[in-house]
């Protein structure tokens, strides 16, 4: 596979040829880290240490902003309990997400004490408001994490809030929450390895899993330590975790805890020379690319390796048939001499636990309907014996030979003249952007990876933790500790002044219109268009 | 005050039918599990079945699977257990239970089954 | 299935003396396990619930132990209207089953 990219271009080669806006950020605030995309108002909401941003998704430079420290008496208290004054007793905006129309929900560390409240934003874009509701804040216990260096996942739906998160002070107390809403607040069993071990959460996300919203499905990503016996000495697993929607605790065990709670392990290897597959175990981000059927997304997640001698990367997509096969599938139980993890052989109890209740099905109108024998089941049973294998059963991108790693994904699907294609927007620990395109072989999950671009985005090297796109601006936002930065989706002019470097670019977005590589669009005429993202040959289509 | 009344026993003969009924009354009666179960001439307590709140699905012992069906009519407050194919061995007092969900929290007086060759 | 067993099968006291009886289940059953009295011509009562949560209306007297495998219904101090037959019942797993019963008669 090419390695090289098509075009590299430094930071100043980005600013020089206008492909790059950077707001590089205010002095009192940093860790521009929680993004909020709302392609309605054409606004990029920041969640940051302190400060809350509200950008133009047009020109970055144009924002507004909101002061949320936390109060003297309450950093003091901070700085006695031993935490660094500047980098953990500030309020780090940790959950950014729309709350209804006019609102949004924010919540922060808050100098180790967490904190929500709402933000108002308006009825239409050209109310122009952005300011905290300063007369409502909430307790942020089980929303936001204590530690900033703590990762979090949330997904605000209906009125409540998903959050993986740490839920103490000592950042050990790691759960799966559901707050706000009118219901008792919901999380994962306390205390429990086999639920959770360590875990870092990467992202949650609703999937419908019927045109049955009684069947819908939040998922959470996250990796976390491998349990004893799952793997010799320390390891790192991926993991896909689920938990039904309308999933309210148990009648008598698991009360206010989740009963639908069930996780798998995500594989994303490549076969090493010695017969042994090396993995990517690190999942950093996810992105779910919704086509057609949102019951069906594709998963691309973003790994890294574990070890610190071999370092590499690597990008694997998952279908989701074969993570429910999975759930579908046995789940890991520990039994024989040596306490071994295998798969359960025994009586499953009916409904099946991770099952949805619904009236559609056996008439479970709730899980509080369960009887006990699935309740304790699903306590003791939380995770799946079958790992989800990735499409291809390969990686689809993977880096190994480079000083960076990946960091996070977004992706975009293009319409080209021979098809479609999805463009992988990859960011690294050092500060650069990777355009990937993935091209189908002999079939569509087949693919052949090709790098267009590699962009520096900000001046001091520094790794994104943050990227949104908009298909609407056709524009790229990406968040670091330094700043944020902004760049166009496709750079056409820079592949060159000829027809047969256009074409051998390969980029789905760019197509040769006669006189120059600019963008293509499918609308436009074919005969006076110029591309070949499959086999890049321009010998075929350029007459020139 | 919670009550539970059996109706519907008898002799019957060997390979024949029966339906039990369970009127209950002084409880919301479609908030709870309901069960059956008998009791063999001076022998221990077996459970036969229990059904769920919404009458959506049932739960069998192997010994009655395929020959009794519990089901309910929330509307009336009763419980049902229709029995085919009745064996000697399914000669008992049959009670009708509130619960099986966890415990067993309130039982009927029993009404007599005789199976008879 | 989970197999209960009682013992002793029969247990004679007298009142005032304190009973234990015990029931064992073939494989752990958490605290899923239940304890019922019945006395001749009568249907079953609930005494304990989960092997140790007392229902209101049982005297005090009664008293469950145990998690896992092994419980215990403990009767501090005997009453003439306690001599009756005891039936320990788990709701871990369908199907639910029964022990055999522990009959206490007056010594």
């Known amino acids: 596979k090419n390695n090289v990219p098509r075009l590299k271009l430094s930071y100043k080669e980005m600013l020089e040829s206008n492909n790059v806006i950077t707001f590089n950020g205010l002095a009192n605030s940093s860790s521009y880290h929680t993004f909020l995309l709302d392609e309605e108002r054409s606004r990029l909401y920041v969640g940051a240490k302190d400060h809350i941003f509200s950008f133009d998704l047009v020109n970055i430079k144009d924002f507004q902003k909101i002061v949320w420290p936390v109060s003297y008496t309450r950093r003091d208290e901070c700085k006695w309990a031993g935490k660094d004054i500047l980098k953990e007793c500030a309020n780090f905006i940790k959950v950014l997400k729309a709350y209804n129309q006019t609102h949004l929900y924010a919540c922060g560390t808050g100098a180790f004490h967490p904190i929500c409240t709402y933000i108002e934003i308006g009825h239409h874009p050209e109310d122009n408001i952005f300011k905290l509701e300063n007369s409502h804040f909430e307790n942020g216990r089980g929303k936001s994490p204590y530690d900033p260096k703590l990762l979090t996942a949330s997904l605000l739906i209906d009125g409540e809030l998903y959050s993986g998160t740490a839920a103490d002070f000592m950042g050990r107390d790691f759960a799966i929450f559901r707050t706000l809403g009118h219901h008792h607040p919901i999380r994962t069993e306390q205390h429990d390895s086999r639920w959770l071990n360590d875990p870092k959460f990467i992202s949650a996300h609703l999937i419908s899993e019927s045109d049955n919203p009684e069947d819908d499905k939040v998922y959470f990503f996250f990796r976390e330590n491998a349990i004893d016996g799952e793997h010799s000495g320390k390891a790192t697993h991926a993991r896909i975790g689920q938990i039904c929607k309308n999933d309210f605790g148990g009648h008598r065990s698991l009360v206010n805890k989740w009963t639908t709670f069930l996780k798998a392990r995500l594989i994303c290897s490549v076969p090493g020379p010695n017969g042994i597959d090396t993995h990517f175990d690190e999942l950093q981000d996810v992105f779910l690319m919704n086509f057609k059927d949102p019951k069906n997304p594709v998963v691309y997640g973003v790994f890294t390796t574990s070890s610190n001698i071999f370092k590499g990367s690597a990008v694997c997509m998952y279908s989701m048939s074969d993570v429910r096969r999975v759930f579908l599938g046995p789940y890991a139980h520990r039994d024989g001499p040596n306490y071994q993890w295998v798969p359960y052989q025994g009586r499953v109890p009916y409904p099946r636990p991770g099952t949805c209740p619904s009236k559609t099905f056996g008439g479970f109108d709730s899980t509080k309907d369960l009887p006990d024998d699935v309740i304790t089941f699903a306590r003791s049973h939380p995770a799946m014996y079958n790992p989800v294998f990735p499409m291809n059963n390969r990686p689809i991108v993977i880096k190994t030979d480079v000083n960076y790693q990946f960091t996070q994904i977004v992706v975009d699907r293009v319409d080209a003249e021979d098809g479609q294609y999805d463009v992988m927007f990859i960011g690294t620990d050092v500060g650069t952007v990777l355009k990937v395109v993935s091209i189908p072989k002999e079939t569509w999950y087949d693919l052949e990876e090709v790098l267009l671009e590699e962009m520096t985005v900000f001046r001091e090297p520094t790794a994104i933790s943050a990227m949104e796109l908009s298909t609407k601006q056709q524009q790229l936002y990406i968040g670091s500790t330094a700043g944020v930065a902004q760049l166009p989706l496709h750079r056409c002019d820079i592949y060159g002044k000829a027809c047969a470097e256009c074409c051998l670019a390969r980029d789905p977005y760019c197509a040769w219109d006669g006189s120059a590589c600019s963008r293509y669009f499918p609308t436009a005429k074919r005969a006076t268009r110029a591309q070949d993202i499959r086999n890049g040959d321009p010998l075929t289509h350029c007459s020139d | 005050e919670v009550q539970l009344v059996e109706s519907g026993g008898g002799l019957v003969q060997l390979g024949g039918s029966l339906r039990l009924s369970c009127a209950a009354s002084g409880f919301t009666f479609s908030s709870y599990y309901m069960s059956w179960v008998r009791q063999a001439p001076g022998k221990g307590l077996e459970w036969v079945s229990t059904?769920?709140?919404?009458?959506?699905?049932?739960y069998y012992p192997d010994s009655v699977k395929d020959r009794f069906t519990i089901s309910r009519d929330n509307s009336k407050n009763t419980l049902y257990l229709q029995m085919n194919s009745l064996r000697a061995e399914d000669t008992a007092v049959y009670y009708c239970?509130?619960?099986?969900?966890?415990?067993?929290?309130?039982w009927g007086q029993g009404t007599t089954v005789t199976v008879s060759s | 299935e989970i197999v209960l067993t009682q013992s002793p099968a029969t247990l004679s006291l007298s009142p005032g003396e304190r009973a234990t009886l015990s029931c064992r289940a073939s494989q752990s059953i958490g605290d899923y396990l239940h304890w019922y009295q019945q006395k001749p011509g009568q249907a079953p009562r609930l005494l304990i619930y989960?092997?140790?949560q007392s229902i209101s209306g049982i005297p005090a007297r009664f008293s469950g132990s145990g998690s896992g495998t092994d419980f215990t219904l403990t009767i501090s101090s005997l009453e003439p209207e306690d001599f009756a037959v005891y039936y320990c019942q788990q709701g871990y797993s369908f199907p639910y089953t029964f022990g055999g019963g522990t009959k206490l008669e007056i010594k």
């Open positions: 059904i769920i709140k919404s009458g959506g699905y049932a």
């Open positions: 989960y092997a140790s």
């Open positions: 239970v509130k619960g099986g969900q966890g415990a067993m929290d309130y």
